[in-house]
Amino acid sequence: QNCSGPCRCPDEPAPRCPAGVSLVLDGCGCCRVCAKQLGELCTERDPCDPHKGLFCDFGSPANRKIGVCTAKDGAPCIFGGTVYRSGESFQSSCKYQCTCLDGAVGCMPLCSMDVRLPSPDCPFPRRVKLPGKCCEEWVCDEPKDQTVVGPALAAYRLEDTFGPDPTMIRANCLVQTTEWSACSKTCGMGISTRVTNDNASCRLEKQSRLCMVRPCEADLEENIKKGKKCIRTPKISKPIKFELSGCTSMKTYRAKFCGVCTDGRCCTPHRTTTLPVEFKCPDGEVMKKNMMFIKTCACHYNCPGDNDIFESLYYRKMYGDMA
């Protein structure tokens, strides 16, 4: 956004920001806005929280339109009331080993976090906490009513789930790439991030991509067939253009989205790929952003618990990214 014009703000008064989020002036020094937080999309008009040492990382200079809020190199992390230095590792609980990297906490699960899909020998998988054990384990529940028999089992399909890319050694560099995190939004345009050292300098860097698990305006429950409880990957009737902060994708996409369930299960991306998408902005500028495209979704009971940010992150992470 060009800052040379007169300042005019939205008609409503200054916004009320959530606890811990700063009320700041936009990048033009015009209007009061709630500062964007770590990992959120930012623009010149929607700045990152300066009180947390964040800046808007636009990536390549050609894309100075929309970026991701990133902590300055070497920024410490505040986690659970404790301050950790950048590069410091710590165990947050028996389930997670965490590392602070430039203001962001990244955690690897110490427990298996695989998504287990129904199969003929285990049609109703469920995770349970066993006494005396830290990690939850899979158990196979019996169906409540014995109606799934015979040909109906053909509806079950084993899906490949992939863990992190196998580590590689390349020119004295142990290449490691974490899984893509869950999309920051359950509907609409969000971002997904990962950490990798798969670069020429073997230096840890944060990568991000746009993601859309499902459109917000879609009323997906209406499409669930009679007698069914889920619609896993609903058919999108027409190709769509993606929108990002006033810019529109130059191409239309017949994208897949994840559906919904009516029985408490949640549907999340299972296999994804990352492709570049070009956006054209009202001022004619074109920018290229990487975006997640869904190949398959999985519906499961491992829905993220609101009280556990790590389960939220790792039960919903993206498996099998092809890019």
């Epitope: 014009g5 703000c9 015009c30």
Partner: antibody
């Protein structure tokens, strides 16, 4: 009652300086932009400058930028116009105005203070 | 952006309708999509007062006999039934582009 009261005007020689003040009352000062608008004798209105909530952004009429400065002190509910190297053509009534920064511009005006530049 | 008002003087009888035109030298649509065209009245010996903002919105306390309309570069202020207290100089103003500019003023006076 919402009120703006200007002060600091007077007679000054060409090349001289003046500092106009505007004291605001009756509203939350830091929730509004403030502005200065002037009116030469027998002439129309001319926008001079405005300033954002905290004083971190100021916009001035390009022809006045090198000589005039707008500033504010939210603790004192006041806005100022520092005028240097004054010329005869700066002679005018200077109005302080509240700028909503949203739908409308100048929704409250002061009574004005007269600046006369003459030798 | 130059704002040109017509007429410069408008003699009216009390109770008549009055219409003032304001034309901008270029489109005054702000980059946010709004048109910041305003009308001010300066009564004799007084400070200006806001009447209309964003082309057609009356400021609080402004009688409904005042109405604003227009788009692009052509705008109009109408007073449906002129009253004695309406006399003075009317200015249009654009706040969409720098420098912010006023029209030269239209003097509404009794015939």
């Amino acid at each position: 009652e919402v009120q703006l009261v200007e002060s600091g005007g007077g007679l000054v020689q060409p090349g001289g300086s003046l500092r106009l003040s505007c004291a605001a009352s009756g509203f939350t000062f830091s929730d509004y932009y403030m502005a200065w608008v002037r009116q030469a004798p027998g002439k129309g209105l001319e926008w001079v400058a405005n300033i954002n909530y905290y004083g971190s952004r100021t916009d001035l009429l390009a022809s006045l930028k090198s000589r005039f400065t707008i500033s504010r002190d939210n603790a004192k509910n006041s806005v100022y116009l520092q005028m240097n190297s004054l010329r005869a053509e700066d002679t005018a009534v200077y109005y302080c105005a509240r700028d909503t920064s949203r739908g409308s511009y100048f929704d409250v005006w002061g009574a004005g203070t007269t600046v006369t530049v003459s030798s | 952006v130059v704002m040109t008002q017509t007429p410069l003087s408008l003699p009216v009888s009390l109770g008549d309708q009055a219409s003032i035109s304001c034309r901008s030298s270029q489109s005054i649509v702000h980059y946010n999509g709004n048109t910041y065209l305003e009308w001010y009245l300066q009564k004799p010996g007084q400070s200006p007062q806001l009447l209309i903002y964003k082309v057609s919105n009356r400021d609080s306390g402004v009688p409904d006999r005042f109405s604003g309309s227009g788009s692009g570069t052509d705008f109009t202020l109408k007073i449906s039934r002129v009253e004695a207290e309406d006399l003075g100089v009317y200015y249009c103003f654009q706040g969409s582009h720098f420098p912010l500019t006023f029209g030269q003023g239209t003097k509404l006076e009794i015939k």
